[in-house]
Interface confidence: medium
């Protein structure tokens, strides 16, 4: 359930440009993950479940954390790349 997703983030510097990696702690609430077609690959949740997760950024799913993250577009920051910088 998206509205129960924890969207607070760990902001890090990815390069010399001011970008942000946003990583929420997202529990899967016991739901079994469906495997995608072919060779047992799992579908990228950023393409479906989290397609609207990042407001001004690109979604990247972190398998180790079982959570989506956001790489913010230049000039934006915040937990969901939601805000124009001060």
């Amino acid at each position: 359930d998206l509205q129960e997703a924890d969207l607070d983030l760990l902001r890090v510097t990815l390069s010399s440009k001011p970008q942000a990696l946003a990583t929420p702690n997202k529990e899967e609430h016991g739901k079994r993950k469906k495997k995608g077609k072919g060779l047992g690959k799992k579908r990228d949740p950023c393409l479906r479940k989290y397609k609207d997760f990042c407001i001004h950024g690109e979604c990247k799913y972190v398998k180790e954390l079982r959570a989506p993250s956001c790489i913010c577009h230049p000039g934006y920051h915040g937990e969901r790349c939601h805000g124009l910088s001060l």
């Epitope: 924890d6 969207l7 607070d8 702690n25 407001i55 915040g78 937990e79 124009l84 910088s85």
Partner: antibody, heavy 116, light 106 residues
């Protein structure tokens, strides 16, 4: 269950400083930003700033940059806000709050009264 | 910073009545957020990303809008809905809140 427990009410004299606390429980403290919000009858709700407990990185509302100092103590999962050079305009309820989709978790608030 | 103006400042409604309050932004925002606050309590998140209901919020609440004009609607007023409602934006830093709409029960 996520809980944010704030320190009790404060009665302070003008020009003094005060430090209020917000103890977090029920989640990974280092993984979530803590925000602070001021509520006064005159100005409604005002966002003061945010701190990333993991890095110590802070973003202030320019209006409060000279007034508030945000810190955290990761060992006790506690966030702090110090307010300095207090005047009657600083009398308000101060909240710590944590985001889920927006400000979904709030402390119970700390009433700060500035009076001689 | 973006200024949010809520109207009306105070309103009253009878049980079962439809209630609509508005929030106008001084500049265009991507999304609006709505909170409910009762005396002596902390604000409670009702609506996120303009129209999504926060967990545990009754379905009689709904949000809509875009650009600079947003609204919160209660389809059928209940006594427990008497409270002050605040809109909030964070499309531009610093995040800002509206001045609130106080909703009373008739």
């Amino acid at each position: 269950e996520v809980q944010l427990q704030q320190s009790g009410p404060e009665l302070v004299k003008p020009r003094a400083s005060v430090k209020i606390s917000c103890k977090a429980s029920g989640y990974s403290f280092s993984g979530y930003y803590m925000h602070w919000v001021k509520q006064s009858p005159e100005k409604s709700l005002e966002w003061i700033g945010e701190i990333n407990p993991s890095t110590g990185g802070i973003t202030y509302n320019q209006k409060f940059k000279a007034k508030a100092t945000l810190t955290v103590d990761r060992s006790s999962s506690t966030a702090y806000m110090q307010l300095k050079s207090l005047t009657s305009e600083d009398s308000a309820v101060y909240y710590c709050t944590r985001i889920t989709w927006a400000f979904a978790y709030w402390g119970q608030g700390t009433l700060v009264t500035v009076s001689a | 910073q973006i200024v949010l103006t809520q109207s009306p400042a105070i309103m009253s409604a009878s049980p079962g009545e439809k209630v609509t309050m508005t929030c106008s932004a001084s500049s265009s925002v991507t999304y609006m957020y709505w909170y409910q606050q009762k005396p002596g309590s902390s604000p409670r998140l009702l609506i996120y990303d303009t129209s999504n209901l926060a967990s545990g919020v009754p379905v009689r609440f709904s949000g809509s809008g875009s650009g600079t004009s947003y609204s919160l609607t209660i389809s059928r007023m209940e006594a427990e809905d008497a409270a002050t409602y605040y809109c909030q934006q964070w499309s531009s830093y610093p995040p800002t809140f509206g001045g609130g709409t106080k909703l009373e029960i008739k």
